[in-house]
Interface confidence: medium
């Protein structure tokens, strides 16, 4: 028979044949052959793989570093990574929660929608068209672009979500 060019779900193609992927929580030891199944082994303590895979090494569980204010929210298993969170009163700087801050700053291009309180973190929002923020701040809202017209000037450079417009003198020449 013709060797396959594609395999079913949860299989992979190797040496012109389809082998079963290893299930989550297990790593690949050896590929299947004409006569043998794929050989897989469970991940060790403090390791995981969260997908059907052909990885030869499991991933290390995330370390929740107390020096960064982190603690374990959910212990990892052979199929899931450890989930970190921050100590009481601190907030994660990102979705991945790699470090903690007393309250988060909004990056350039984002403004503060709601200032942090004792229980909730800063809420940021993207600056809409016509507004900008050029600083990283835990307090500043998006600022409106300068209105060149009210200063009897014209826009020389368009504004962005991170920069104000640049105004310049009107061209005095008239046709």
């Amino acid at each position: 028979p013709e060797p396959p060019t594609a395999c079913r779900e949860k299989q992979y193609l190797i040496n012109s044949q389809c082998c079963s992927l290893c299930q989550p929580g297990q790593k690949l030891v050896s590929d299947c052959t004409e006569f043998t199944e794929t050989e897989c082994l469970p991940c060790g303590e403090s390791e995981f793989l969260d997908t059907w895979n052909r990885e030869t090494h499991c991933h290390q569980h995330k370390y929740c570093d107390p020096n960064l204010g982190l603690r374990v929210q959910q212990k990892g298993t052979s199929e899931t990574d450890t989930i970190c969170t921050c100590e009481e009163g601190w907030h994660c700087t990102s979705e991945a929660c790699e470090s903690c801050v007393l309250h988060r700053s909004c990056s350039p291009g984002f403004g503060v929608k709601q200032i942090a309180t004792g229980v909730s973190d800063t809420i940021c929002e993207p600056c809409p068209v016509g507004f900008f923020s050029n600083v990283s701040s835990a307090f500043e809202k998006c600022h409106p672009w300068t209105s060149c017209e009210t200063k009897d000037l014209v826009v020389q450079q368009a504004g962005t979500n991170k920069t104000d417009v640049v105004c310049g003198p009107q061209d005095r020449l008239r046709a």
């Epitope: 020096n67 960064l68 601190w90 007393l102 700053s105 701040s137 307090f139 500043e140």
Partner: nanobody, 116 residues
Framework: EVQLLESGGGLVQPGGSLRLSCVAS????????MQWVRQAPGNGLEWISA????????YYADSVKGRFTISRDNSKNTLYLQMNSLRAEDTAVYYC?????????WGRGTLVTVSS
């Protein structure tokens, strides 16, 4: 290396005033929003005030609004906190901070004790 040195703390009676100072070095002071944070005995850190890099915009926690005033002198790389109408619950170690990361550099703080 970032350094923040707070001073001005001490023992004061309820209703009294104090002015805290924080001298900064090791970074371009006027580029940064600066903050005052405090920690009362046995409590977590409490953010109390912040000021924009140019000094034009100030922010306060409800617990100190109307009593405390934050200011800065960028020519002297110094942050200030004027504290009026002090109460017993204002007793804490006061820190100035450049950023509020758990691992960021914090000064050693200055102790404010409000007691009769």
């Amino acid at each position: 290396e970032v350094q923040l040195l707070e001073s001005g703390g001490g023992l004061v009676q309820p209703g009294g005033s104090l002015r805290l100072s924080c001298v900064a070095s090791g970074f371009t002071f006027e580029w940064y929003e600066m903050q005052w944070v405090r920690q009362a005995p046995g409590n977590g850190l409490e953010w109390i005030s912040a000021i924009s890099g140019d000094g034009y915009r100030t922010y306060y926690a409800d617990s100190v609004k109307g009593r405390f005033t934050i200011s800065r002198d960028n020519s002297k790389n110094t942050l200030y906190l004027q504290m009026n109408s002090l109460r017993a619950e204002d007793t804490a170690v006061y820190y100035c901070a450049k950023e509020l990361g758990y691992f960021d550099y914090w000064g050693r703080g200055t102790l404010v004790t409000v007691s009769s």
